[in-house]
Interface confidence: medium
Amino acid sequence: KFSKQSWGLENEALIVRCPRQGKPSYTVDWYYSQTNKSIPTQERNRVFASGQLLKFLPAAVADSGIYTCIVRSPTFNRTGYANVTIYKKQSDCNVPDYLMYSTVSGSEKNSKIYCPTIDLYNWTAPLEWFKNCQALQGSRYRAHKSFLVIDNVMTEDAGDYTCKFIHNENGANYSVTATRSFTVKDEQGFSLFPVIGAPAQNEIKEVEIGKNANLTCSACFGKGTQFLAAVLWQLNGTKITDFGEPRIQQEEGQNQSFSNGLACLDMVLRIADVKEEDLLLQYDCLALNLHGLRRHTVRLSRKNPIDHHS
């Protein structure tokens, strides 16, 4: 019951807390169980006891074994056991299961990944974070105190996250790494009949002959990841690609995931060098998913240039 598993990598710092708790004023004695040999408290030793903490600075594979801690008070003694395993460093990126700390789950609203065991160490910010052995880069990732925050969490963010920090002991620095899996909970994603946000139905768009014009078709499809969501433009009921007018092209706009979690798509229709005949066409913004198709129609009208009188 009062036994705790601890593990670490060779040549890294490992600090283990006695599984039996006591007041700071209580003395704690540590022993190597196999030999019943007392662990020294002098900090010049590579392995030494410091109250409730047992420190391996740094750890070696040979340190593996069961350590006994006895918490002594004036009225009682409490005994705990720390089962310590020190592993050789892996040559490849793969982190084996036995080196993994507990899995944490995150979601769009809560995406904190705490660095395991870090509170036992004397460390200073910043923490370094890696996912599947790759250093995390980009504004979505923020190392904050002892945890990592991921903005706009996606299912792709699931994986193994490793935190790396430096433990300082009397001016000497020791590296520590800890890895845990992160899973992403789908916060009740759903799919709904497409909702076109722009353009408005039967909108009239004013354009200038000879100038360029852009029309944006924007639609939302639900929350979370969507299967088969599409936004496209048609001209007179024909796909742009089949219409055969090189001046008129569609290109993807921004994927959007609004703060309320809605999944939306944009498609921009670009008309170069607007001509009179473009005013005669019917422009349809189509949004489609598994539930159905929604269509908003736009027509172009000539914008009269403003007369500038002297």
Epitope: A229, A230, K239, E252, N255, M267, L288, G292
Partner: antibody
């Protein structure tokens, strides 16, 4: 004519990652979504996920979430499927397949995979 | 997820035989069902979409029927090139395939 050409066979060790490519030609790349389907030796077909070249949207089968990443490069009309933390049971032929649907029906239901890549054998072995 | 089952899992037939393969869905999928043919070492090939629509270039001896939960693929007169494995796939939601039916020579 429409073609989906996949990258060559790969042999990987457990725990490694693999990235398979699928180059599309003969049609407008951004118009059709691309799916990935895998087939273990002697087994049936298993859907892995979908990517929309127009916008890069992805949806993955629950089984692969957290291990699969699909991306696309519109400049080369190529989609990629990367699978990480490989295990022996990931040994399979991985196919890319174009998804089509009749917009006249007014919905995406009724989609079908009309063109397939030739397949890429990924072998995971220690 | 919608689960798909197929029967039989394999069958032996002769050239000229009429062959019927059935596919069942665990929920009503209307007519959103496709059929594919796969030969050893090759990619699947679309035969039928939306339960009964024949893909262009596919011989008319192939036909599909059914709606709701029960579907059938029929080969009216089996040809030598038809010996293969056949898969059904629902397209009502994210795709799931049946386990396949292998048609081999008797």
């Amino acid at each position: 004519q429409v073609q989906l050409v996949q990258s060559g066979a790969e042999v990987k060790k457990p725990g490694a990652s693999v990235k398979v490519s699928c180059k599309a030609s003969g049609y407008t790349f951004s118009t059709y979504d691309i799916n990935w389907v895998r087939q273990a030796p002697g087994q049936g077909l298993e859907w892995v996920g979908i990517i929309s070249p127009s916008g890069g949207w992805t949806t993955y089968a629950q089984k692969f979430q957290g291990r699969v990443t699909m991306t696309r490069d519109t400049s080369t009309s190529t989609v990629y499927m990367e699978l990480s933390s490989l295990r022996s049971e990931d040994t399979a032929v991985y196919y890319c397949a174009r998804v089509n649907y009749d917009i006249l029906t007014g919905q995406g239901r009724g989609y079908y995979f009309d063109y397939w890549g030739q397949g890429t054998l990924v072998t995971v072995s220690s | 997820d919608i689960q798909m089952t197929q029967s039989p899992s394999s069958l032996s037939a002769s050239v000229g035989d009429r062959v019927t393969i059935t596919c069942q869905a665990t929920q009503d999928i209307a007519d959103y069902l496709n059929w594919y043919q796969q030969k050893p070492g090759k990619a699947p090939k679309l035969l039928i979409y939306k339960a009964s629509s024949l893909e262009s270039g596919v011989p008319s001896r192939f036909s599909g029927s059914g709606s709701g939960t029960d579907f059938t693929l029929t080969i009216s007169s089996l040809q030598p090139e038809d010996f293969a494995t056949y898969y059904c796939q629902q397209s009502y939601s994210t795709p799931t395939f049946g386990p396949g039916t292998k048609v081999d020579i008797k």
